[in-house]
């Protein structure tokens, strides 16, 4: 950056080189150039000469004043007009930054995705700080009282192998930058209570043309957890409102769930599961589309990311890919 240049003087910022966004700031430039009594001192921001709010303090020093400075980053340098010099002489430069102290981190959540071997901790960091902000995740065993700290700039994955202090822990997050420091409240966890089962996936769907047409959704998970509760939500793609069905599930075999749906309508399905009675759910699975046939089956067009075809008495869709969707993700 501009801070690496050779200086013939000194540039400094008050109150500091990193300051709160919206503050009034002063940038001072002091020349120390051999055989030069500067006629004029100039300031440049991001290479553009500043023309206003410059005050000459004495023979070698000038001040540039900014009101309500709102730029997250700027490169400042100053120059001198020396007698007998054709060009301006560079005095010095400095990178300045403005931003905000961190908010109190909240919504601290730690989960163990089955088979991942990690505990993943996330939090809501609050408003954008604009400046380098680091987070320290504190994990303290309630059994041994031993505390471990993990430095990160966003979320953290902690190997479950490193959690040697039993099953119960306190977790909290400290956020710090040049403008302030905040800490979250403490989350108490039990490792057995935060496991999220291996992802549930909808593999295919078929509509059987019986007296009342019936759609069967086939779905599965590789989980080894015995007691799993799941929800499947579905709606016509033209609807806003989801219908939700709940299941107590044993994944020793592929699940088949039956739905009685309107004919000739494109539906979307998603599934999610949790260990029964525990706190955290999987995110909703990829969107799975299936178009129900007209009362007399006919070939239907390709559905988004799935193939739909005519198979005599059934119309089926199979999953051919994954489209992730978080648990707030509705489609219109």
């Amino acid at each position: 950056g501009i801070t690496n240049i050779n200086c013939s003087g000194h540039i400094w910022v008050e109150p500091a080189t990193i300051f709160k966004m919206g503050m009034n700031i002063s940038i001072y430039c002091q020349a120390a150039i051999k055989n030069c009594q500067p006629r004029k001192l100039h300031f440049y921001k991001n290479g553009i000469k500043e023309r206003f709010q410059i005050t000459r303090i004495n023979k070698t020093t000038a001040r540039l004043w900014y009101k309500n400075f709102l730029e997250p980053h700027a490169s400042m340098y100053c120059t001198a007009e020396c007698p007998k010099h054709f060009q301006e002489t560079l005095i010095c430069g400095k990178d300045i930054s403005s931003g905000y102290p961190p908010d109190i981190p909240d919504e601290v959540t730690c989960v163990i995705y089955e088979y991942s071997g990690n505990m993943t901790c996330t939090w809501n960091a609050g408003k954008l700080t604009y400046i380098d902000t680091k987070y320290v995740v504190h994990v303290k065993s309630l059994e041994t009282e031993e505390e471990q700290q993990y430095l990160t700039s966003s979320y953290i994955n902690i190997s479950t192998d490193s959690l040697q202090g039993g099953k119960k822990y306190l977790v909290w997050v400290q956020a710090a930058n040049a403008l302030g420091m905040e800490e979250s409240k403490q989350l108490q966890i039990h490792l057995d209570d935060i496991v999220i089962p291996s992802a549930a996936v909808i593999s295919r769907a078929e509509t059987i043309n019986a007296t009342v047409p019936k759609t069967i959704i086939y779905w599965d998970s590789q989980t080894t957890i015995e007691k799993v509760s799941c929800e499947m939500r579905y709606k016509a793609t033209t609807n806003q409102t989801w219908n939700v069905k709940e299941f107590d599930t044993n994944f020793t075999y592929v699940q088949q769930s039956e739905f009685y749906l309107e004919p000739n309508i494109k539906y979307v399905f998603q599934v999610r599961c949790q260990e029964t009675g525990k706190r955290y759910w999987q995110p909703w699975s990829s969107l799975f589309f299936h178009k129900t046939p007209e009362t007399v089956p006919q070939v239907t067009s390709k559905a988004f990311q799935h193939d739909t075809w005519n198979s005599g008495l059934t119309v089926a869709s199979i999953s051919t890919g994954h489209l992730t969707s978080d648990n707030r993700g509705d489609i219109g």
Epitope: I104, E147, G180, Q186
Partner: antibody, heavy 116, light 107 residues
Framework: QIQLVQSGAELVKPGASVKLSCTTS????????IHWMKQRPEQGLEWIGR????????IYASKFQGKATLTTDTSSNTAYMLLSSLTSGDTAVYYC?????????WGQGTTVTVSS | DIVMTQSPKSMSMSVGERVTLSCKAS??????VSWFQQKPEQSPKLLIY???NRYTGVPDRFTGSGSATDFTLTISSVQAEDLADYHC?????????FGGGTKLEIK
């Protein structure tokens, strides 16, 4: 701007009770813990206890169990400490502060004088 | 409860001198120690957290060090405005506890 503003000085009689307040601004009181400290003249700081304003959960130092009762009113972002059965040993400056491990913001303190 | 012991109780130093304040914990507290400065008739102000992290706006003449049971606050070149009481405290476990304080006087 983050501030903790405490109620004014109190002169109370032995055996009486007093309720101190700590009104916060610049943050949501439910996002942090409020702690209370005692400081007698020319002495160190003593931690009284902590409240989680989000749910009212409290932790007290054993010495202050039964002496201090911590509450909050989240609608007004205010924390309270009730001190009961006051004796001369309760004469002190009481501070509220906020945080989990590190106390970066403090109230200005409330002086409680117990005298007949 | 964890007992925090500060020494000395008071000290008198000249401007420009190096000052070292000690704080000892009765058991291992990791780095869960903070230092506070309290000027006459004022509330305590956080100087150092996590044993060695300087809080925002604290002059760099203040340095914290140590872990486990022995902690030090160093003022590299004491200034007249550093006249104050200095407290150490632990946040390793409940109840939170503090040392008795060190009174720093300026000659």
């Amino acid at each position: 701007q983050i501030q903790l503003v405490q109620s004014g000085a109190e002169l109370v009689k032995p055996g009486a009770s007093v309720k101190l307040s700590c009104t916060t601004s610049g943050f949501n009181i439910k996002d942090t813990y409020i702690h209370w400290m005692k400081q007698r003249p020319e002495q160190g700081l003593e931690w009284i206890g902590r409240i989680d304003p989000a749910n009212g959960n409290t932790i007290y130092a054993s010495k202050f169990q039964g002496k201090a009762t911590l509450t909050t009113d989240t609608s007004s972002n205010t924390a309270y400490m009730l001190l009961s059965s006051l004796t001369s040993g309760d004469t002190a400056v009481y501070y509220c502060t906020r945080g989990t491990s590190w106390f970066a913001y403090w109230g200005q303190g409330t002086t409680v004088t117990v005298s007949s | 409860d964890i007992v925090m012991t500060q020494s000395p109780k008071s000290m008198s130093m000249s401007v420009g001198e190096r000052v070292t304040l000690s704080c000892k914990a009765s058991e291992n507290v990791g780095t869960s120690v903070s230092w506070f400065q309290q000027k006459p008739e004022q509330s305590p102000k956080l100087l150092i957290y996590g044993a060695s992290n300087r809080y925002t706006g604290v002059p760099d003449r203040f340095t914290g060090s140590g872990s486990a049971t022995d902690f030090t606050l160093t003022i590299s070149s004491v200034q007249a405005e550093d006249l104050a009481d200095y407290h150490c405290g632990q946040s390793y476990s409940y109840p939170r506890t503090f040392g008795g304080g060190t009174k720093l006087e300026i000659k």
